[in-house]
């Protein structure tokens, strides 16, 4: 059976500006020309979509204008960046890859990246 394996880091720490980046890599069982990458957030047993983008192999990954995600692609590797994160957004972020075209369709799901977000301490007032 041809399976599609998806690899992503286990843990990532967001920057003080609330930006987290990680690589999502997939082993393609076929020669896909169109790929969809989705970032899912799993909290308890609820899974929600954070962002999604479809790209043609060899072209750039394009998220919607209002998306909190950006990314670049290189072969079977996608570099994902999620911005605007706050402490309450700490959780498991799953990379889902779908080979959309040509058929057959293939689904691949990573084990998830635990993203830790720490809200920056407010700057103390200065007495000058």
């Amino acid at each position: 059976c041809k399976a599609m394996h998806v690899a992503q880091p286990a843990v990532v720490l967001a920057s003080s500006r609330g930006i987290a980046s990680f690589v999502c890599e997939y082993a393609s069982p076929g020669k896909a020309t169109e790929v969809r990458v989705t970032v899912l957030r799993q909290a308890d047993s609820q899974v929600t979509e954070v962002c999604a983008a479809t790209y043609m192999m060899g072209n750039e990954l394009t998220f919607l204008d209002d998306s909190i995600c950006t990314g670049t692609s290189s072969g079977n590797q996608v570099n994902l960046t999620i911005q605007g994160l706050r402490a309450m957004d700490t959780g498991l972020y799953i990379c889902k890859v779908e080979l959309m075209y040509p058929p057959p369709y293939y689904l691949g799901i990573g084990n998830g990246t635990q993203i830790y977000v720490i809200d920056p301490e407010p700057c103390p007032d200065s007495d000058f």
Epitope: M4, L40, T48, E49, M100, Y101, L107
Partner: antibody, heavy 109, light 102 residues
């Protein structure tokens, strides 16, 4: 509905309560007293589709995301297409998590 | 398999699903169907319970052999059960197992 062999029929499935365009949607059928048979799937913006061999070339799946509606155009119907047809939503992690109540299609002369 | 499982309420039910080839990344789901109703998702990949499914239902397995276990049968659990692979098209269903009252 009841339709004669060789004729056509279009099924529709209206969804609500979720962001329709963010999910793939399947058609699954069940002949009387038989098991579930996958028929077709359509993904997201409607450009990518896949069909079971038994319906390829006869059935066409489509969707209108502005109307939250899924369609199945069935042409050249045969007696063996008689079944209850279900639409089902693809969950974020892949299985079919919500199913319509089903529509009975009877192909008979 | 088997096609029909005849058991009594309170008993343990073990249903098996065997694939002809290894299932991609264990993308296997189990559905329950009662007469006149649409199927309902129970378990996916292959041991996560769907929302609202009691913990008496559990799934296990990998590769080609998968199992759905109902630890203690309640009257409402007597129904038809189907497995399905959803990792690649075509998205095939198993033939189904009927769990009926002995």
């Amino acid at each position: 509905g009841v339709v004669q062999p060789g004729r056509s029929l279009r099924l529709s499935c209206v969804a609500s309560g979720f962001i329709f365009s963010s999910h793939g949607i399947h058609w699954v059928r069940q002949a009387p007293g038989k098991g579930l048979e996958w028929v077709a799937v359509i993904w997201y913006d409607g450009r990518n589709k896949d069909y079971a061999d038994s319906v390829k070339g006869r059935f066409t799946i489509s969707r209108d995301n502005s109307k939250n509606t899924l369609y199945l155009q069935m042409n050249s119907l045969r007696a063996e297409d008689t079944a209850v047809y279900y639409c089902a939503r693809v969950a974020p992690l892949g299985p079919l998590d919500y199913w319509g109540q089903g529509t009975l299609v009877t192909v008979s002369s | 398999s088997p096609g029909t499982l005849s058991l009594s309420p309170g008993e343990r039910a073990t249903l098996s699903c065997r694939a002809s080839q290894s299932i991609s990344s264990n993308f296997l789901a189990w559905y329950q169907q009662k007469p006149g109703q649409a199927p309902r998702l129970l378990i996916y990949r292959p041991s996560s319970r769907a929302t609202g499914i009691p913990d008496s239902f559990s799934g296990s397995g990998s590769g080609t052999d998968f199992t759905l276990t109902i630890s203690r049968l309640e009257p409402e659990d007597f129904a038809l059960y189907y497995c399905q692979q959803y990792g690649t098209s075509p998205f095939t269903f198993g033939p189904g197992t009927k769990v009926d009252i002995k």
